[in-house]
Amino acid sequence: GWVWNQFFVPEEMNTTSHHIGQLRSDLDNGNNSFQYKLLGAGAGSTFIIDERTGDIYAIQKLDREERSLYILRAQVIDIATGRAVEPESEFVIKVSDINDNEPKFLDEPYEAIVPEMSPEGTLVIQVTASDADDPSSGNNARLLYSLLQGQPYFSVEPTTGVIRISSKMDRELQDEYWVIIQAKDMIGQPGALSGTTSVLIKLSDVNDNKPIFKESLYRLTVSESAPTGTSIGTIMAYDNDIGENAEMDYSIEEDDSQTFDIITNHETQEGIVILKKKVDFEHQNHYGIRAKVKNHHVPEQLMKYHTEASTTFIKIQVEDVDEP
């Protein structure tokens, strides 16, 4: 019968011919009376056999990631009779792995959105690298992830590639971060290959800013001839949040005379001071009112950022009109 061991050939061997093993019949007594032949895909081009001894050689550099095994057929013929000594047999040459592929991030570009002020430990995104080397061959495809850029705000779980928040972030200070993740094979041991990817992490807004009046004092004038409902001026607060988190409502906090009102222009986010009752210069020629501003909607958990509403003082001068 046929005699052989399992055949392995390392990939990427640079030698012109690499001895893989021997294929022989147990009837071969070594007197060179038998001829060995190799058939199948790769026979003659990738692998050759010594016709006398049955020694098999690889004569080409192999790439396991391109092809990991070859199925060949062997024949042995009695030179004198030309007859087969053994039935034709099929055998396998396996290409063994070396660490010749770096980890690659296939889902690039990565982008994630996470709410500002999220607590430590909040999951942001998972990045995954793949390594074309053999996962069953040592540590060639066993990856470890690490953070090259992004401290102290982010961390990455070494074995999963899960990125988490490690420090609270304020969108109004910085609204996006570039994080660079490295994946290393060989679980980081010497000879490891690595690949990197960038992750753009954008912070979405939460309502952590209250609106504040830029001016602590406004001076407006109103003619004593102005009818009720007249707009006598605008006041404005600023809120560094965006979208609905910056929507605000103006109101009167103090107006002993109950002469004025404030309505909110939700397009411009300005407060419009309105005359609620007619004024008379001869009766009172100036007024002082205090206005306040609050966000339209503040979730309960964010009330700690909105403890005291901003106010401003408005001095209103009444203009005299000649009366008949």
Epitope: E172, N209, K214, S216, Y238, T311
Partner: antibody, heavy 125, light 105 residues
Amino acid sequence: QVQLVESGGGVVQPGRSLRLSCAASGFTFSRYGIHWVRQAPGKGLEWVAVIWYDGSNKYYADSVKGRFTISRDNSKNTLYLLMNSLRAEDSAVYYCARRAGIPGTTGYYYGMDVWGQGTTVTVSS
Amino acid sequence: YELTQPPSVSVSPGQTASITCSGDRLGEKYVYWYQQKPGQSPILVIYQDNKWPSGIPERFSGSNSGNTATLTISGTQAMDEADYYCQAWDSSTVVFGGGTKLTVL
């Protein structure tokens, strides 16, 4: 790393002028408002002026209004403070300080997150 | 607009130090706190009343209500000995408090 470096300080006679510079590095200078803050020997911090990231707004303390001018050259990553009609009470260490906050946010909300090491101005006859 | 701070505050190591800053309707504004050690530039330790800049330990905390803002340092350490300044915006100008010297006994 993020850095602000002041220069231009020195001894000057009352009534004369001096120009301070503040060179920025390690961050995108053109995206940040910058303040000048001073500190007289043994005294507290006194705000001097601020300029918005694009130079659109400039505000001054009453004590320097009309005498000091804040300006910036974003192409050179440099902030300036031109001080005219100097007085003895202007003697101080002058710091430039970066306004925290992303561009587009209102400057009135933010503190100063990066400071230079300061440059000393002495006004004396 | 004026911000008033006590000139000095003393605290034993490991205890809690409180530094106040008062101003008219200060609770309506945002307050910032700076630490300055001798010969050094100031460092922002609290912004917008109660938020921490990156790298500032959470033993520093802030509050602001009514006419008074407070910087609290819990478990005070010798390294916390410094001058502390509060700051706020009034209209378009910046105002600093006079500063408080914190002594760790």
